[in-house]
């Protein structure tokens, strides 16, 4: 059995481990801590620039957080023999700006992946599917955590960030078994319409702290297993009838809508009526108007149709610039 090892005990061994020999079962990479009894390897806050090659075969939980990995190439975790037990991989806060196609290939048990807090200027469409086939082998991923992966403006590619992330999520229909997806704090202005249709097993979806203005073109219809939908801290103004009906039709869902700038005019009437009768929205009594000024801080549940008016549109001849 391996004790919790640090660089002091494993560095001498590492010097002789540069060949392609399979790792010894109890080996611990330099700058890492290992416990076979916990099936865990932690290489945390060590400024690593690449994934250690000599990871022990028993690893089920791998923490590579707080490093300086920059690029995750294809086959970054491919080993011979493979890391067949690796189930949870946390790469958060490791200064990744590029995740290439096939980065997570040859990890047959990988169920949980956290790439949060990495400024991903490039996320390959085939990062999770591993191949460019129209239908690829199903990914074993069940939980995918992609909070705060938006790069700074000067590092963005020409294409939209939303589109880049969406392409990786839908490629090859590989993520059909995904249960949890976190996409919080990514400055999303919209959600590409085809994404959710390719993720039919979702139970938990976190889109909080983005800049979503509307859900008009988003369909939740086939997310029949969805239990939690987090839309807090966005820029939502109103939810329209189509969205309301779809949410109401999901059998298990709880929706979180706090801290959105709701516009309480005549277009809000349907949503207010729905809020009063639905059990879907958690904390619905906390939802308040942000606009127009005269309605600011009014509680949505306390509004009636007389409160929700729209200023008449003036004929063009009477409008001023």
């Amino acid at each position: 059995t391996s004790s919790a090892s640090s660089s002091s005990s494993s560095a001498p061994f590492l010097a002789s481990a540069a060949s392609a020999q399979p790792p010894l079962p109890d080996q611990c990479p330099a700058l890492c801590e290992c416990s076979e009894a916990a099936r865990t390897v932690k290489c945390v806050n060590r400024n690593l620039t690449e994934v250690p090659t000599d990871l022990p075969l028993y690893v089920r939980n791998l923490f590579l957080t707080g490093n300086q990995l920059a690029v995750l190439p294809a086959g970054a975790f491919a080993r011979r023999p493979p890391l067949a037990e690796l189930a949870a991989l946390n790469l958060s806060g490791s200064r990744l700006d590029e995740v290439r196609g096939g980065a997570f290939e040859h990890l047959p048990s990988l169920r949980q992946l956290d790439l949060s807090h990495n400024p991903l200027a490039y996320l390959s469409p085939f990062a999770f599917s591993g191949s460019n086939a129209s239908i690829s082998a199903p990914s074993p991923l069940v939980e995918l955590i992609l909070n705060h992966i938006v790069p700074p403006d000067d590092k963005r590619q020409n294409r939209s960030f939303e589109g880049m992330v969406a392409a990786a999520l839908v490629a090859g229909r590989a993520l059909q078994g995904l249960h949890l997806l976190e996409l919080a704090s990514n400055h999303f202005l919209y959600l590409p319409r085809d994404v959710l249709a390719q993720l039919p097993s979702l139970r938990y979806l976190d889109l909080s702290n983005n800049s979503l203005v509307s859900l008009t073109y988003v369909s939740f219809r086939n997310l029949t297993h969805l239990e939690s939908l987090h839309l807090e801290d966005n820029a939502l103004k109103v939810l329209h009838n189509g969205t309301l009906a779809e949410l109401q039709g999901l059998p298990h869902v709880r929706v979180f809508l706090d801290n959105n700038p709701w516009v309480c005019d005549c277009h809000m009437a349907d949503m207010v009526t729905w809020l009063k009768q639905t059990g879907v929205v958690q904390g619905k009594d906390r939802l308040t108007c942000a606009f127009p000024e005269k309605m600011r801080n009014r509680v949505l549940l306390e509004l009636n149709s007389a409160d929700l008016d729209c200023d008449p549109i003036l004929p063009p001849s009477l409008q001023t610039s």
């Epitope: 059995t1 919790a4 416990s35 009894a37 865990t40 932690k42 089920r60 939980n61 946390n90 949980q112």
Partner: antibody
């Protein structure tokens, strides 16, 4: 949330075999590590051993020659057998589970059975 | 095997006071250490895992610290329900081992 319910004989004679079973409710069998721990009267906790969903076991060396832990995934149950018991094996026996593959995964045993008091007496 | 030694064996304090419990390992266990609370007739309850992470539902007054061989469980302001026996446990190496316990009693 996983819950554990355990049962088995509470009174044994010296040299008999202790046999306890723990049923798992409300969760998947994979990803968990299933353990047995015991606590003699008025004393501390002693880890007996553990098994994972694939049947891989680890035992306390002090008990290894007498212990068998097995798993029946079809019934969502795991079991403990301790042979050739003596009065020193009198204790409360707990089954426990820890989940090693969630982000806030626990290195400790995070779900415990209610405990079974086993008395060895002639 | 790794031996965990807890101190003190008994700690007598009053509600509202701060409790500091110690656990020392015979060799490094890195951060692979947990703390449990046990009340009479009950199974142990996980408080802290990974040396410093509070388990789900555990009040913020419980905190853990340490790495390597020396670990501390701190209860910032004792509530009446906190008086119990506390165990540390390592998952660095087989066999998994527990400390002998610290009994926290009302003064």
């Amino acid at each position: 949330q996983v819950q554990l319910q355990q049962w088995g004989a509470g009174l044994l004679k010296p040299s008999e075999t202790l046999s306890l079973t723990c049923a798992v409710y409300g969760g998947s069998f994979s990803g968990y590590y299933w353990s047995w721990i015991r606590q003699p009267p008025g004393k501390g906790l002693e880890w007996i051993g553990e098994i994972d969903h694939s049947g891989s076991t680890n035992y306390n060396p002090s008990l290894k020659s007498r212990v068998t832990i097995s798993v029946d995934t079809s019934k969502n149950q795991f079991s403990l057998k301790l042979s050739s018991v003596t009065a020193a094996d009198t204790a409360v026996y707990y089954c426990a589970a820890w989940f090693g593959e969630l982000w806030d995964y626990y290195y400790g045993m995070d779900v415990w059975g209610q405990g079974t008091t086993v008395t060895v007496s002639s | 095997e790794i031996v965990l030694t807890q101190s003190p064996a008994t700690l007598s304090l009053s509600p509202g006071e701060r409790a500091t419990l110690s656990c020392r390992a015979s060799q490094s266990v890195s951060s692979f250490l947990a703390w449990y609370q046990q009340k009479p007739g009950q199974a142990p309850r996980l408080l802290i895992y990974d040396a410093s992470n509070r388990a789900t539902g555990i009040p913020a007054r419980f905190s853990g610290s340490g790495s390597g061989t020396d670990f501390t469980l701190t209860i910032s302001s004792l509530e009446p329900e906190d008086f119990a026996v506390y165990y540390c446990q390592q998952r660095s190496n087989w066999p998994l081992t527990f400390g002998q316990g610290t009994r926290l009693e009302i003064k």
